[in-house]
Interface confidence: medium
Amino acid sequence: VTGSRVYPANEVTLLDSRSVQGELGWIASPLEGGWEEVSIMDEKNTPIRTYQVCNVMEASQNNWLRTDWITREGAQRVYIEIKFTLRDCNSLPGVMGTCKETFNLYYYESDNDKERFIRESQFGKIDTIAADESFTQVDIGDRIMKLNTEIRDVGPLSKKGFYLAFQDVGACIALVSVRVFYKKCPLTVRNLAQFPDTITGADTSSLVEVRGSCVNNSEEKDVPKMYCGADGEWLVPIGNCLCNAGHEEQNGECQACKIGYYKALSTDASCAKCPPHSYSVWEGATSCTCDRGFFRADNDAASMPCTRPPSAPLNLISNVNETSVNLEWSSPQNTGGRQDISYNVVCKKCGAGDPSKCRPCGSGVHYTPQQNGLKTTRVSITDLLAHTNYTFEIWAVNGVSKYNPSPDQSVSVTVTTNQAAPSSIALVQAKEVTRYSVALAWLEPDRPNGVILEYEVKYYEKDQNERSYRIVRTAARNTDIKGLNPLTSYVFHVRARTAAGYGDFSEPLEVTTNTVPSRIIGDGANST
């Protein structure tokens, strides 16, 4: 029965005399008067079986002590650790010439675990063991004897097991413990590859090459290899494994990404939080599912936020010129979180009697610069039929529009070709300018060409250069433009609309808002 004692992880104990409970029962030769089994104590009051001999008075001592058979367990080289006390011959009176201060260590390989006798000739000598510390009689009085620890190794071994033997030639020795062990490189994980327990090589300089296997939920990047050194230490890790998609490295293991996290590829990266507008509901996600109403385009990386189609374009303006129409609009208020916004134009030809009966315009109509995938916010449509009602839809589209097309993404206008629109307005005046508003007034166009249905005022900050404009419509020939910024230059255009469509815009009127209220009369030229 062997008690548990703690030794380094790279040592595998084959024999430990201190852990044996009960008698060791090793074979001594001679049976009497040589080595004697003596029970002493350890610090926990547990008996330790030791072997002692002290025949220092008599010459020509040849006392042998042989262990039981020790299994090799596949080790090619084993280590023997001996802890012992040894008496200083100088402290013993009258023993000159007979007292020795060394003993000899031998081994014998055998497949037979039941050899009953010691045949000295079968044993090979490992070494002569001497003490670093020998004790005198005074030490015994002081109750202290330092233990000597000597370690020897022997190999290569080839048989199933072996016996050790201790030869005393006339010393005063107590073998307090004998431990036999071999060295291994203990099971370890490096670079996500597991390397098994590996017994060291046969000689003290050999390196054993070991191939590792990737831990669960990982895959080889480069073939993982390490070398097991003779001292039981792993050396020179080569290659590695990477955690699979949906897994990340934690303490040498590949753990599934937590809920709300993902990892798309086999890399050494950690799991990342799901991008905006997406989620994962399982552990080990390789991508995140888009929230309801949000989508990911085919070429969007898993790391990109989920996006949605844009809202409709704003402020659509049409300008009819016989069988041509110019359309202009502003960007949508909501781009859906994407940069790849473009515009498609849908042209429908509608019956005069029933505007609801509309058909596609067909291939005879031409668009400048193009009908679909427009990057600008204007288009010219030509080669329309005269005296015909047309409805034009401007669709804002992005990379995910195809997943959720909706009328909410378009704006439309209906026009009739081949009717004269009103002429442009000649004079626009700023009647009153304050910090936050401008009061405009204008005259009717010289040629209204019919009943003027409404006026449209287009204005923008001068330095915005028409990139972002606003529209105000009114039936009167004046209007108050409110919500302006103080001390800012604005440009105003006005045009009239009849049943035939819009006329051209007036010449620009530039007005700068004030810090102090004052009345300014404009004459169509710049006003400050």
Partner: antibody, heavy 126, light 112 residues
Framework: QVQLQQSGAEVKKPGSSVKVSCKAS????????MHWVRQAPGQGLEWMGG????????NYAQKFQGRVTITADKSTSTAYMELSSLRSEDTAVYYC???????????????????WGQGTLVTVSS | DVVMTQSPLSLPVTPGEPASISCRSS???????????LDWYLQKPGQSPQLLIY???NRASGVPDRFSGSGSGTDFTLKISRVEAEDVGVYYC?????????FGQGTRLEIK
Amino acid sequence: QVQLQQSGAEVKKPGSSVKVSCKASGYTFTGYYMHWVRQAPGQGLEWMGGIIPIFGTANYAQKFQGRVTITADKSTSTAYMELSSLRSEDTAVYYCATAPMVCSSTSCYLRGFDYWGQGTLVTVSS
Amino acid sequence: DVVMTQSPLSLPVTPGEPASISCRSSQSLLHSNGYNYLDWYLQKPGQSPQLLIYLGSNRASGVPDRFSGSGSGTDFTLKISRVEAEDVGVYYCMQALQTPITFGQGTRLEIK
């Protein structure tokens, strides 16, 4: 269990010698330190010397050097203490006491006197 | 030689009460291995001494836990948490760091 059985009481003349025996049982005799301690009537304890049988020779208190001899017979597990040139002040109870050797991972030391004999009264009188 | 001095030499105690005996050595009993080489013994009337405490603070096998040893270097104490009638006798401290092994002069514990 461990037992130390001492020889019987002795009456000795001044100048003579006395040899007290202590037979051990219940443990490995050779591995334990055997001490001898005496106690004069109404007095305290006085250490005389000791021996580890396996290691042969004994060591003694300076006070008794030259007058005391401690030996051990491994074959009978018996320790002996012989005191010569007896004087009246050597009248005392003589005890044998054993101390086990204790080994840690780095050293061995001798524990306290775990077991005592029953004592042998030696009277020195003319 | 190491001189051991005990106090008090006589200690009358009421049963159930605690008792404390002091022992002072003329030089340190602390070995480099961390152990204090001091033992305590009790000699009951008409009996051989018996080991109570070894190496300063370790209770010997079979000794009741009301006995405890403490101290280090040159100052040591034996404490009995609740004295019982069977605890009467002479208590000795002993140093075993170096030869000759020496004892204190003894403290006689008696019941009031």
